[in-house]
Amino acid sequence: LEIKVNPPQDFEILDPGLLGYLYLQWKPPVVIEKFKGCTLEYELKYRNVDSDSWKTIITRNLIYKDGFDLNKGIEGKIRTHLSEHCTNGSEVQSPWIEASYGISDEGSLETKIQDMKCIYYNWQYLVCSWKPGKTVYSDTNYTMFFWYEGLDHALQCADYLQHDEKNVGCKLSNLDSSDYKDFFICVNGSSKLEPIRSSYTVFQLQNIVKPLPPEFLHISVENSIDIRMKWSTPGGPIPPRCYTYEIVIREDDISWESATDKNDMKLKRRANESEDLCFFVRCKVNIYCADDGIWSEWSEEECWEGYTGPDSK
């Protein structure tokens, strides 16, 4: 006799208004008496509709939450599993049931903001900027909302950057416990003459940090050939262990680059008689603290003002 199990009931994808953080939920299947004591597990697969691959999780729960790109639709499917020890060693699963979440097509794509860029300056404040949609009426203005886990609900930007009295960006500070988790943004718009398409963005703050440049550069030469360069990590909340550095060294007309995770570097002069010895440095959050980052601006150039060659007095 073939053992069968029913799929979960009432599978749906719900939007609680958190700008892309959706709830996938379902109810237990109708289970025949024989399996009442068995633990049910659910295999859930989901993706944005343009994605090639499904994300798969197994859960004993009746809800799963994750972040999605709401610029695109979402689809999911789920089935019930009975573990083998409940079914005389055979693997038993129900048919799949499916659910989808369609995006709002209100407003043409040309009304959506363009070139959304966000930078988390020195791990202290976030600045996002955008350009208006390609074809919008002059009365169009945009509003930015954001949410991350820890906030009760989505919040609106309180400090807009403006151009010609229109919102073209937003500055956010005091983002407590907001890194190492998905940060969701929605920029929607309003016009009396046409609906405006919303734009959604999701990223993690630690991956878009632009630090301040290193400071207090110092260069010294020992034994007339050993160069030592030092600098200080910029002030702010970024731990010193989180920096990586790129250094440009210039000796007379020759310059070359080097890299280090320390805030000093030693090397040998290329020519004993060189008269010009300078360096400058920039920094970025390293791979131990983030998956990505933005280079700081270059520091001021620091030059050695000492003994320049064996014949100098």
Epitope: T39, I58, R60, N61, Y64, S83, E84, H85, G89, E91
Partner: antibody, heavy 121, light 108 residues
């Protein structure tokens, strides 16, 4: 008596490969999901991979996805972990573990003695 | 991913003491939680599964409680054999299966 016996560990260079085996006895092997769990020297437990009783479904930690492959041969009562592109951070004692009940993973009621994998040049 | 946080990291106690270790999940995991004991150089040993069910052969001085996000492992009267490291583990949702960072119970 349930027994799980790992083998195949050893010293390997970064980028190299190893295949771990876990010989099971004392229970109906094909009726239970199995997992690999590792423990780096002086560190806590880290789940690596799981496989359903039939071998039809496999799951991986993000840290090993695309590099490690879990498989099983129910006719030989043996669980495997093929490890490719090994990195220094894969250095650990690797345990195979039997799931007490559950289709893919659960509480682990029996563990092997562990096999040490060292990735170093 | 569901994060599991154990406290304390280290616990100093004497034989006969009542010892409690806490495990907190970053989201509800119902009762899908296990507790393990591990001694140096040895494999972990299952003590408690489904938050409160005692594994066969485990002394009754060990007990587990809790559901949702807060769980505790209690040793009613600590014995010399109980000095070890204890781990909690969730199996509500995976991948990944996640463990707590461990609590070392040492002699005071």
């Amino acid at each position: 008596e349930v027994q799980l016996l790992e083998s195949g560990g050893g010293l390997v260079q970064p980028g190299g490969s190893l295949r771990l085996s876990c010989a099971a006895s004392g229970f109906t092997f094909s009726s239970y999901a199995m997992s690999w769990v590792r423990q780096a020297p002086g560190k806590g437990l880290e789940w690596v991979s799981a496989i359903s009783g039939s071998g039809g479904s496999t799951y991986y930690a993000d840290s090993v996805k695309g590099r490690f492959t879990i498989s099983r041969d129910n006719s030989k009562n043996t669980l495997y972990l093929q490890m490719n592109s090994l990195r220094a951070e894969d250095t650990a004692v690797y345990y195979c573990a039997k799931v007490r009940y559950g289709w893919g993973a659960g509480a682990f009621d029996y563990w092997g003695q562990g096999t040490l994998v060292t990735v170093s040049s | 991913d569901i994060q599991m946080t154990q406290s304390p990291s280290t616990l100093s106690a004497s034989v006969g003491d009542r010892v409690t270790i806490t495990c907190r999940a970053s989201q509800s995991i119902s009762s899908w939680l296990a507790w393990y004991q591990q001694k140096p150089g040895k494999a972990p040993k299952l003590l408690i599964y489904d938050a409160s069910s005692l594994e066969s052969g485990v002394p009754s001085r060990f007990s587990g409680s809790g559901s949702g996000t807060e769980f505790t492992l209690t040793i009613s009267s600590l014995q010399p054999d109980d000095f070890a490291t204890y781990y909690c583990q969730q199996y509500d949702t995976y991948p990944p299966i996640t463990f707590g960072q461990g609590t070392k119970v040492e002699i005071k």
